[in-house]
């Protein structure tokens, strides 16, 4: 199936021109999504082109300034969060990147009523998280890792807790594994759904081994760098989620929540935490061999001014066959009788689909069944639940929104985006306003993408929220490479891929063929997605076909593909790569003698193992950032996976499916190796040891290490990278410059 | 401090048309919405309408659609609001007034401007 | 639309004295959690004077004895001791729906 034709005939063909590297660079081709932030049922606050922030009310189709470019520009802010009474705005200034999703900030606090900044007992700076009450203007906010509390903003702040302590103990924010591997928030505090409780969880890293890095900078001495990081084995934080009454906190102070026994008796994690009332909580806890998670509902005892979480209110997920969930346990989206709830879960077939659980799991009824699945609950309202799956046309790289009427029985399924923009739109994502009235729909290709805004009642298009007219405009004399999605059928195992195809393609020809991977658990490559990238470049300029396809280990095609991979990384994700490029070869377009692949993480494990494999079928290849060793990287990420680093576990498949353990194998390939040097996530350490390993193994290899960059290699780096990539691939195809 | 200052009173002929002005200063005009409110005698106060003044988007009372359009003037931070085929219970006292949006509430008012509809 | 009614029509009170004005909505005025119901004070020959936004929030510079209270459908002003210029009339405003509607004012009265 062709996703996205160029748009060239002959008469045109002079007009047109290829991309250039300068193009993907430079971000000419990118696109905007629009999602609105909702603030009632039928309004919503957006930056406009001019930096002011405008209220939209859809009912009368008004806007309105609530505030202006200038008082934005006045502390230079950069991001805003309006009070749920609407009083006060939140103004945030002076972002400071930590991790993936921490960062720190100033904070100031605007007056709407009489436009004017709140003076006296200001926040203090920076702050490592900020926001309102769900309900009022009270504020919550994590500094120097303590929690501390405002009835109001002008008022004085109440301190919380007392023990937070830079890399020991973290108040209300997650430390490094939590944000990155469990909770991927900046934050781990939530507020009841009044603003009466605020519930948080407080991590002890004490006795966690700390991975130090050195940090160049400007001085005569680097910095270091140090970060307590459990690795795969090491001893792990210590978690306990506590509930403050934020009416009288002085009162009772924060009580702890219990944790399950079942939970407690070996180490475990806490998974989230989901308000249900004001005065019902519910929390999720998984055991540290992550295939037994564990929801527990708790109350609020008024008498003793604590939380009980009996255990009747424990629902038990347990897989057998691989670990517990997808990329993470999903979360319980509850419905207005406050106590059933809906969660996506492996039915008996080994697809995720929604589940009603009214009383126990056992008894759990199944909302959506199908050889396809469930992939995110949106909005679940009196009568209708919002859900987004890849069911249609059976395409797993699609989404598409559905809504179930659950007011009726039988419940009726409707799809509200198959059919809307059908060529164009396959992928999509939504936003709903309170209680569904209005929704918007972002929908990210594989045409240009295009955001929309809809009746929450008639799912009618109310307006074109953005369209990307100047991209579209841009694009025209632009000579698109083609992009097709199609499957393979090998051995069982249905095999995506998506191929990228030079403009000119020409079937009788032969073209290099480059591999694009990630190939991480439950993770997507084939996606019926628009974007014009680095690989979109090498096609339609450097006249490359590119391949990128889901193997075995991969989401949303069932269980049994998924769950291959567990306890053995390293291993299908490789096969099904070469399987595949097998099978292209085959298609007879394909320049055997110019197949190249190339990763980024995850994806360069897979491609460093890929090009030791010993099947003289890559000529080259690049890493970036990879994994060599499991043991090098996150416990929670790594054992989820492949259990336990030990002898009585699975210490034997951690020893073999290292990158080091195949340096003999590199030496009839071309291997660019890159990283930075202050990764954070996947440390510098694995580069390290594969170029330690292929000096040992007297194996040349080239290497390029960005200083002081983390995982992303971002700025002037990701210019260097890509144009050292280029040039890097371009020598091994033969490829002029 | 702001300050709405409205135009003078106007009589007109049923079957008119009247223009009156409203010209804002101690604020910036682009930042405020503007409504406009009427008076009759002795009677309660009935809205007219809003203007957003960054891209002169309206809003009108369905009562007065086709007879009423409010305009803007930038450079001389002044709005307009016009009603057409005037009869005599348009007789009335015209308000502008400035409408914070995110609490729906006109904060400031003009002086008013008399409209008096008479043959 | 919104019919606002106020009551009583007029209220006779002597400084000093506590004044509650009414005003009822013909449907909810609740948007998600907040009420759009304004207050207003109007002197004779005298433009409207905001005094309470969003049912209970004061405007600008106005005094702590006017307090608004109320959701759905009731509403109320409240003065805790009338002073000699608050005798005047009292008008509520919904801003929840287009068109926004006023009451028909409660004129409060030196006894």
């Known amino acids: 199936i062709v996703l996205r034709p160029s748009r060239v005939h002959n008469s045109e063909e002079n007009t047109m021109r290829a991309l250039t590297l300068k193009d993907i660079l430079n971000g000419t081709f990118s696109y905007k999504t629009f999602f609105p932030n909702w603030i009632s049922g039928q309004e919503y606050l957006h930056q406009s082109a001019d930096n002011n922030i405008v209220l939209y009310n859809i009912e009368t189709g008004q806007s309105y300034t609530i505030l202006s470019n200038r008082t934005m520009k006045s502390v230079n802010a950069s991001n805003y969060g309006l009070s749920p009474d609407r009083q006060f705005v939140y103004l945030e200034s002076d972002y400071s990147k930590l991790w993936r999703y921490s960062y720190t900030a100033t904070y100031y606090i605007y007056d709407l009523s009489n436009g004017e900044f709140v003076r006296g007992n200001e926040l203090p700076r920076p702050i490592q998280y900020l926001c309102w009450s769900p309900v009022g203007s009270k504020l919550a906010y994590v500094y120097q890792n303590n929690i501390y509390l405002k009835q109001r903003p002008g008022d004085p702040p109440f301190q919380i807790t007392f023990n937070g302590r830079e890399n020991k103990i973290f108040n209300g924010i997650p430390d490094w594994v939590y944000e990155e591997e469990m909770l991927a928030t900046k934050y781990a505090l939530w507020w009841s759904p009044n603003g009466k409780f605020l519930a948080y969880a407080e991590f002890n890293d004490t006795d966690i081994p700390v991975i130090a890095y050195s940090y160049y900078g400007d001085e005569q001495y680097p910095r270091t760098i140090n970060i307590p990081y459990p690795k795969a084995g090491a001893k792990n934080p210590v978690v306990r989620i506590f509930i403050i009454d934020t009416t009288y906190p002085a009162y009772v102070g924060p009580q702890e929540v219990p944790v399950p026994a079942m939970i407690a008796s070996s180490d475990y994690y806490f998974s989230w935490l989901t308000w249900v009332t004001d005065e019902r909580v519910c929390l999720q806890w998984l055991k540290r061999v992550q295939n037994v998670s564990v929801l527990s509902i708790c109350d609020f005892r008024e008498d003793w001014q604590t939380w009980d979480c009996p255990k009747t209110q424990e629902h038990i997920e347990e897989s057998r066959t691989g670990w517990a969930g997808g990329f993470f346990v999903s979360t319980p989206v509850f419905s207005y009788d406050a106590i059933s709830y809906y969660k996506i879960f492996s039915d008996k077939d080994g697809y995720k689909h929604i589940h009603y659980i009214k009383d126990t799991v056992e008894n759990a009824i199944q909302i959506t069944s199908g050889k396809w699945e469930a992939i995110n609950i949106f909005r679940v309202t009196q009568d209708s639940l919002f859900y987004s799956s890849n069911e249609f046309e059976e395409y797993p790289g699609r989404r598409n929104i559905y809504r179930i009427s659950i007011g009726s029985y039988p419940p009726s399924k409707k799809c509200v985006t198959c059919h809307l923009r059908k060529e164009r739109c396959q992928y999509y994502t939504a936003s709903f306003s309170d209680y569904a009235k209005y929704y918007a729909l972002v929908c990210y290709g594989p045409g240009i993408p295009i955001s929309t805004l809809h009746d929450g009642r008639t799912d009618q298009e109310i307006k074109i929220l953005e369209e990307n007219k100047e991209l579209e405009n841009a694009l025209k004399n632009i000579q698109l490479p083609k992009e097709e999605i199609k499957k393979l059928e090998v051995d069982e195992i249905t095999l995506w891929y998506k191929m990228i195809l030079p403009p000119q393609f020409d079937r009788s020809k032969k073209y290099p063929l480059l591999i694009q991977v990630y190939g991480g658990p439950c993770s997507q490559s084939v996606r019926s997605v628009f974007a014009v990238n680095w690989i979109s470049y090498l096609a339609s300029k450097e006249g490359m076909v590119i391949a990128l396809v889901d193997g075995r280990g991969t989401a949303f095609q069932g269980d049994k593909l998924l769950y291959a991979v567990y306890r053995k990384l390293g291993v299908y994700e490789v096969e099904d790569q070469i399987t595949a490029v097998r099978k292209f070869i085959e298609m007879g377009f394909i320049d055997e003698k110019r197949i190249a692949i190339w990763g980024w993480s995850y994806g360069g494990y897979v491609s460093s193992l890929a090009l030791a494999s010993g099947t003289g079928l890559f000529k080259c290849g690049i890493a970036v950032a990879p994994v060599s060793s499991w043991e090098y990287y996150a416990s929670v990420y790594t054992e989820r996976f492949m259990g336990l680093p030990t002898k009585d576990d699975n210490l034997e498949h951690y020893k073999n499916s290292t990158v080091m353990a195949r340096a003999e194998y590199f030496r009839n390939v071309d291997y660019l190796l890159i990283h930075g040097t202050a990764d954070d996530n996947v440390h510098f350490q694995n580069s390290a040891q594969i170029a330690k390993a292929l000096v040992n193994a007297q194996v040349d290899f080239q290497a390029m290490w960005y200083s002081d960059q983390n995982h992303g290699l971002s700025g002037l780096s990701t210019n260097h990278l890509y144009t050292h990539m280029t040039h890097f691939l371009k020598q091994c195809f033969s490829l002029s410059d | 401090q702001v300050q709405l200052v409205q135009s003078g009173a106007e009589v007109k002929k049923p079957g008119a048309s009247v223009k009156v002005s409203c010209k804002a200063s101690g604020y910036t005009l682009t930042d405020y919405n503007m409504d406009w409110v009427r008076q009759a005698p002795g009677k309660s106060l009935e809205w007219i309408g809003d203007i957003y003044p960054n891209t002169g988007g309206t809003i009108y009372n369905q009562k007065f659609k086709g007879r009423v359009t409010m305009t803007i003037d930038k450079s001389t931070s002044t709005v307009y609001m016009e009603l057409s085929s005037l009869r005599s219970e348009d007789t009335a006292v015209y308000y502008c007034?400035?409408?914070?949006?995110?609490?729906?509430?006109?904060?400031?008012w003009g002086q008013g401007t008399t409209v008096t509809v008479s043959s | 639309e919104i019919v606002l009614t106020q009551s009583p029509a007029t209220l006779s009170l002597s400084p000093g004295e506590r004044a509650t004005l009414s005003c009822r909505a013909s449907?909810?005025?609740?948007?998600?959690?907040?009420?759009?119901i304004n207050w207003f004070q109007q002197k004779p020959g005298q433009a409207p004077r905001l005094l309470i936004y969003?049912?209970?929030n004061r405007g600008s510079g106005i005094p702590a004895r006017f307090s608004g209270s109320g959701s759905g459908t009731d509403f109320t002003l409240t003065i805790s001791s009338l002073e000699p210029e608050d005798f005047a009339v009292y008008f509520c405003q919904q801003s929840n729906e287009v068109p926004y509607t006023f009451g028909g004012g409660t004129k409060v009265e030196i006894k």
């Open positions: 449907e909810s005025v609740d948007n998600y959690g907040l009420s759009f």
């Open positions: 007034t400035r409408f914070r949006g995110i609490h729906y509430a006109m904060d400031y």
């Open positions: 969003g049912t209970s």
